[in-house]
Amino acid sequence: VPDKTVRWCAVSEHEATKCQSFRDHMKSVIPSDGPSVACVKKASYLDCIRAIAANEADAVTLDAGLVYDAYLAPNNLKPVVAEFYGSKEDPQTFYYAVAVVKKDSGFQMNQLRGKKSCHTGLGRSAGWNIPIGLLYCDLPEPRKPLEKAVANFFSGSCAPCADGTDFPQLCQLCPGCGCSTLNQYFGYSGAFKCLKDGAGDVAFVKHSTIFENLANKADRDQYELLCLDNTRKPVDEYKDCHLAQVPSHTVVARSMGGKEDLIWELLNQAQEHFGKDKSKEFQLFSSPHGKDLLFKDSAHGFLKVPPRMDAKMYLGYEYVTAIRNLREGTCPEAPTDECKPVKWCALSHHERLKCDEWSVNSVGKIECVSAETTEDCIAKIMNGEADAMSLDGGFVYIAGKCGLVPVLAENYNKSDNCEDTPEAGYFAIAVVKKSASDLTWDNLKGKKSCHTAVGRTAGWNIPMGLLYNKINHCRFDEFFSEGCAPGSKKDSSLCKLCMGSGLNLCEPNNKEGYYGYTGAFRCLVEKGDVAFVKHQTVPQNTGGKNPDPWAKNLNEKDYELLCLDGTRKPVEEYANCHLARAPNHAVVTRKDKEACVHKILRQQQHLFGSNVTDCSGNFCLFRSETKDLLFRDDTVCLAKLHDRNTYEKYLGEEYVKAVGNLRKCSTSSLLEACTFRRP
């Protein structure tokens, strides 16, 4: 019988008392085979973290700063359940730390030196740790003691709770630096008042502070937010302009064998029976003998943290950067305006080989990081382990939802002004063998399908989106008798046709022979009835253009396209017989790396792009014998996006809507995790 006990860690006598009450009340409402609570008392949160890591306890609720500590080795804990605030309809699990300024003040984030600052309090998250952590490497040396460095960075501050004797400049704007509401500039509202009164130039608060203090839009319009990319935005655009997105209060558990499903089962049942307004006898979110015991008194309920989410992703790149800077206190030697090497994310073995070759040829401008799947690469770019990669539109969507931005687009047509003219896109098509003459778009049910990969544009999002509109359910593995759609669940019929050996079967990378455009076409040639690819795939792999044994004798004339009206056309008539127009593949990165990735890639393509004539003796960025490694092999150049610099603008409203409709069929664990952070 599996042990269904969750050992909750308490950090005080009062918490232990509440925990015992929690245990007893749960016993009275949960069947004997359901989850139960046991209580473990420790002296501090750090002791609780160590106890969970050592398997002496299972769960504890922590503030964001402690979630970071819990994540660090050797603890390796992960977030499993989040408290939420507000209503069930609009649950808030995060708040945003922001920098508020007056509209007419004219400076940006990188011009804060010499300004006057208003803080909620020394050592507090939004008011001190996050802004000072992000500014850390701009502070004058020596950076220790930190208060002295901050005092020398700003021309005056109000940082309540600071030592006014040792650091008088930190109390210059609020004499005495009082650490309670007796100081009119203490806390969120106090820091905002410090700005409003004209004492300071910038207030470090949270996103709701301005709405809690100013009821009129006309008054709020006198203020703006400073964004990390050195722009400003209106105060209601905090989701796109903040210093960090911070989780409010989170239950953590072990990453391996951490009972996360059991913890969720327990807390979900607990909120049903003892949540807000549920029971007079015991209330989960109430602390008669103290404040915020076990859980925050202000919480309204719990939400399950998606399993794909580790602590780094949950806390977010900006928060982790700020806290790491403060804790470790390390900065690059002398900060220069020069770009650091771009860390390119390479998928599996084949891409890594090409990337290493690129790295050597780039003389240190490019470094390589490996991952097994596209989603793993996106996650690495999010958390700073990697910087960039080129993605199919379907993954540009996921990357965008995860906060990344497109920076350059692959162009596939030769033109005089390639780098300045991003193309409208390519065509997603359905290819069949000419010999299967009875096959049309309308009778694909029960046939064998070949896809580039789950979540990709031409191979999945477009055809499956169209199919979903027809069949109104997500059971595509029942619609086709079998197929190869790399990235599907291994036991799915959509992995049955795949050719990868052992663990590589159906993997969404080049270790699966039927992965990508060329792989999906090969699947059609060897086993399938229909392949969902791009309009260039057939000509690129027929007529001797692909020398691989399976392709070298293929003839374009032996294949036809399925049109949406139920007819068929020759391959060259793709412009009048396609499923949809697909956005070109694009390079994505984090917002903070956008300028450097743009600059370095443009240099790199001038050195190794289409202008290189002999690829046998020289490195060619856009060549890999039809394997589309790192970039599509038919890329002519990487083009500027001009104003299409967000994933929505780049992909276009129609495609975003189409992928959004398919979201209900999504198996993307990363998309689930990212929409948890930003619904």
């Epitope: 507000g86 609009d90 808030q92 709405f211 203090n213 009821a215 009129n216 209601d236 807000k276 309204h300």
Partner: nanobody, 123 residues
Framework: DVQLVESGGGSVQAGGSLRLSCAAS????????MAWFRQAPGKEREGVAA???????TYTDSVKGRFTISRDVAKNILYLQMSSLKPEDTAMYYC?????????????????FGQGTQVTVSS
């Protein structure tokens, strides 16, 4: 979630006064913005006045100078003092609350409403 219960409505002559009250079951993040709405027969519900967590207020033009919104945070009660009442103020008055993720004057974002209290102003 938060429960809101209004009281204080009634019938009054034009030029008279009324004070509406609204008791909130809990004081929480989702009551940081509170407002009064009204709905006259055959018309859409409209925002009348709102108050932010720390007391800043906003009014729709038609009631400025006549109505005052206030709140007692300790008791979780919202008030609307209405004076110089006019027949066109006749309506069902609702108390509402929302989280401070947008302006308290953004009436379309209010998510929780009470059952309402009737105010009738006769000439």
């Amino acid at each position: 979630d938060v429960q809101l219960v209004e009281s204080g409505g009634g019938s009054v002559q034009a030029g008279g006064s009324l004070r509406l009250s609204c008791a909130a079951s809990i004081y929480t993040y989702s009551t940081a913005c509170m407002a009064w709405f009204r709905q006259a027969p055959g018309k859409e519900r409209e925002g009348v006045a709102a108050i932010a967590r720390y007391g800043d207020t906003t009014y729709t033009d038609s009631v400025k100078g006549r109505f005052t919104i206030s709140r007692d945070v300790a008791k979780n009660i919202l008030y609307l003092q209405m004076s110089s009442l006019k027949p066109e103020d006749t309506a069902m008055y609702y108390c509402a609350s929302k989280s401070p993720n947008s302006g308290c004057d953004e009436y379309a974002h209010y998510e929780t409403f009470g059952q309402g209290t009737q105010v009738t102003v006769s000439s």
